[in-house]
Amino acid sequence: MKVLQEPTCVSDYMSISTCEWKMNGPTNCSTELRLLYQLVFLLSEAHTCIPENNGGAGCVCHLLMDDVVSADNYTLDLWAGQQLLWKGSFKPSEHVKPRAPGNLTVHTNVSDTLLLTWSNPYPPDNYLYNHLTYAVNIWSENDPADFRIYNVTYLEPSLRIAASTLKSGISYRARVRAWAQCYNTTWSEWSPSTKWHNSYREPFEQH
């Protein structure tokens, strides 16, 4: 039994890191393998992650971690019984994929303005709480070409757009994702989408 693709890990910079790797053949990850991990820290202890299958030869492990700080470094040991298959390390702050924003809501009761709000996925004491920026994707269910992205580079988790920038009388969907420039993170997954019917009063034409 050998590792074909070494584990690569990403952290949500909060409490979970996800590591994925591939073996050289079909493997029952949960019964044959264990991933041991430990924070390099005086007050830390070793933890064991039981991997799950991710395709025939692929394995994935969800590592429960202490709140992350930038200096953290974890040692990783991949075992098959008594055999050490791979040894490595992982700095969560260098491989961050933020959590997806939640609770996306479209408020349509403001006159001719759409207000989109969502929740920051981090608690206020987390470093990323004040460092996330967002991308909001709005698209028409009727017209695949009617697809737009709004970059929200301020900290407030909201976006205002004129209802008239979208077509009236049809349904739209929106979703939002996050990233943090400070740690050069990847984008988060998209939030679940939300749907609304766009309608607004057309302005009277002047003759």
Epitope: L42, E45, A71, D72
Partner: antibody, heavy 115, light 109 residues
Framework: EVQLVESGGGLVQPGGSLRLSCAAS????????MFWVRQAPGKGLEWVSG???????SYADSVKGRFTISRDNAKNSLYLQMNSLRAEDTAVYYC?????????WGQGTLVTVSS | EIVLTQSPGTLSLSPGERATLSCRAS???????LAWYQQKPGQAPRLLIY???SRATGIPDRFSGSGSGTDFTLTISRLEPEDFAVYYC??????????FGQGTKVEIK
């Protein structure tokens, strides 16, 4: 908002015991290492003890064998059991959250060891 | 055990002046594990700088940290009245734990 509130300080005779408590709120207590740091009157800061999320502990040489740090994650509380107290243990005792450094501190509780 | 020595013991300056505080370690310290704190009379210490040069949340940009190895510096570019306080450096070591310098008092001249 992160809050750490110490209690349990007071006047105790040399050789006596005292138990300090720290009530934590505003963060996930169970995922953070916690510490006690003290400051003798007019002196500098001295790290006393720390406890990791899994219960691993460490102590300064000056208190080893006399002080015991513990935590109750269900109650979001940190404790310091201080036995065989000496005059040189007189200090303000701060509860702090952190790891390699201490990012949040309580306001401290005064322990006076005197006959 | 790593010993941190801060200098000067007291720094007498006027508001608007630049303050330069030094922290010297008895052996090499990882920059990732060097921090600075501010403490005012009757108050708990407050984290200013971690990782030798990163400002903690809410700390004004007039505070900056630098250095590596055994020599570290905290600089206050223009002293404000609220900056007069005692400043401590602190390091973490995987075997010895956490130690503080003895402090530098920044007082009004």
């Amino acid at each position: 908002e992160v809050q750490l509130v110490e209690s349990g300080g007071g006047l105790v005779q040399p050789g006596g015991s005292l138990r300090l408590s720290c009530a934590a709120s505003g963060f996930t207590f169970s995922r953070n290492a916690m510490f006690w740091v003290r400051q003798a009157p007019g002196k500098g800061l001295e790290w006393v003890s720390g406890i990791g999320t899994g219960g691993a502990t460490s102590y300064a040489d000056s208190v080893k064998g006399r002080f015991t740090i513990s935590r109750d994650n269900a109650k979001n509380s940190l404790y310091l059991q201080m036995n065989s107290l000496r005059a040189e243990d007189t200090a303000v005792y701060y509860c702090a959250r952190g790891r390699y450094y201490f990012d949040y501190w309580g306001q401290g509780t005064l322990v006076t060891v005197s006959s | 055990e790593i010993v941190l020595t801060q200098s000067p013991g007291t720094l007498s300056l006027s508001p608007g002046e630049r303050a330069t505080l030094s922290c010297r370690a008895s052996q090499s310290v990882s920059s990732s594990y060097l921090a600075w704190y501010q403490q005012k009379p009757g108050q708990a210490p407050r984290l200013l700088i971690y990782g030798a040069s990163s400002r903690a949340t809410g700390i004004p940009d007039r505070f900056s940290g630098s250095g590596s190895g055994t020599d570290f510096t905290l600089t206050i570019s223009r002293l404000e009245p609220e900056d007069f306080a005692v400043y401590y450096c602190q390091q973490y070591d995987h075997s010895a734990g956490w130690t503080f310098g003895q402090g530098t008092k920044v007082e009004i001249k």
